[in-house]
Amino acid sequence: MAVTACQGLGFVVSLIGIAGIIAATCMDQWSTQDLYNNPVTAVFNYQGLWRSCVRESSGFTECRGYFTLLGLPAMLQAVRALMIVGIVLGAIGLLVSIFALKCIRIGSMEDSAKANMTLTSGIMFIVSGLCAIAGVSVFANMLVTNFWMSTANMYTGMGGMVQTVQTRYTFGAALFVGWVAGGLTLIGGVMMCIACRGLAPEETNYKAVSYHASGHSVAYKPGGFKASTGFGSNTKNKKIYDGGARTEDEVQSYPSKHDYV
């Protein structure tokens, strides 16, 4: 029950996180005009990954796309790439995790397959979240650098009578959305990975007990098999996900308290 809850919660948290990453990527407010200690203008500038916008006090807003690839800063291109990779990985992760959910039964999918898929989606969510956090952080760093450069420019070269106003940009709403969304996706991924361990318990739980003649000592690989949970008439032992990766040589059966029935 706890495993199902952890897996379900991980899925929901990741879903919210990826929706947030998509929203942040599409938002225009990655950087907004800094209003602090600046002359008050009747025009407000803000920029996104894909276009820059200007909102006049009347409410009229005009946005212009960046209709160039080569002319854009490499850092902006890198941020775009990180966000897109994050979205793609997150979307694939969501798709995989839907089939991995314990509460959803698809044909006769084994628990081992579900465990593998849960782990895969968890890793994808973690990487997706890290991509988003990295992308937003790179952009934020770029803003901080430019902010102090433009601040320095504001106080130099003002010998003439005519003053020029340097538009400075600060953190926009999209950055905070991106950080939170990336964090949620990361947390969701960790929860999926935790749930994966629960889907593959170390000990074997028997519901259908098989009896053997005393002369036959049937050795099972510890934790490697699990008796059927009793759906349908299938009472054969099923191989489930084995937490530790082992080589062929290592797969030997040593006597344990679980070996004999």
Partner: antibody, heavy 118, light 113 residues
């Protein structure tokens, strides 16, 4: 069509508060802002302030301590209050609609003459 | 506050001739975000309220004759009337529409020579 009409007392005593109303028609108060401008006799234009569609206001820094601009959407009216008036406040007072783009003033009222005198 | 300086104070031009009015602002009116200059030109005829002619320094308001054109960027702007007509006799004002408080130039009185 778009129309703006200023109204108010033509004569105000010094130190009193000047109250003017701008009644508008032909446009939505939730879409357009309104500016107040004045013009002393034989002189140039002086911007007093603006109230934007969202309700935010901006004022001339020289008049900020004395001026208040407000809106009554139910009556389609904008109002200007200027306190502690002096003879220097004698002027023709205009209200004008804020253009949707360019921050210009695209429609103007005919103006109302206000004289400050005892 | 932004200071708008117009020149000349008055101008006399013959009918059909070109009239040029200059306006200088104490700070740039160019917005880097959209590369537009927030300068507006108005025409005020005697006994009438001002009329919007040009916004964004060079965009003509609808209904304004083509002979009126605006140019310039940053801090220096020009209003040009390509061929002066009798009905163009008026006072012309430039306005800072970028920084609060919005400020007007002192005006240029245009007359016929």
């Amino acid at each position: 069509q778009v129309q703006l009409q200023e109204s108010g007392p033509g004569l105000v005593k010094p130190s009193e508060t000047l109250s003017l109303t701008c009644t508008v028609s032909g446009f939505s108060l939730t879409t357009y802002g309104v500016h107040w401008i004045r013009q002393p006799p034989g002189k140039g234009l002086e911007w007093i302030g603006v109230i934007w569609a969202g309700g935010s206001t901006n004022y001339n820094s020289a008049l900020m301590s004395r001026v208040t601009i407000s809106v009554d959407t139910s009556k389609n009216q904008f109002s200007l209050k200027l306190s502690s008036v002096t003879a220097a406040d004698t002027a023709v007072y205009y209200c004008a609609r804020a253009a949707y783009y360019g921050n210009g003033l695209d429609y103007w009222g005919q103006g109302t003459m206000v004289t400050v005198s005892s | 506050d932004i200071v708008m300086t117009q020149s000349p104070d008055s101008l006399a031009v013959s009918l059909g001739e070109r009239a040029t009015i200059n306006c200088k602002s104490s700070q740039t009116l160019l917005n880097s975000g959209n590369q537009k200059n927030y300068l507006t030109w108005y025409q005020q005829k005697p006994g009438q309220p001002p009329k919007l002619l040009i916004y964004w320094a060079s965009t003509g308001e609808s209904g304004v004759p083509d002979r009126f054109s605006g140019s310039g960027s940053g801090t220096d702007f020009t209003l040009t009337i390509s061929s002066l007509q009798a009905e163009d006799v008026a006072v012309y004002y430039c306005q800072n529409a970028y920084f609060y408080p919005f400020t007007f130039g002192g005006g240029t009185k245009l007359e016929i020579k």
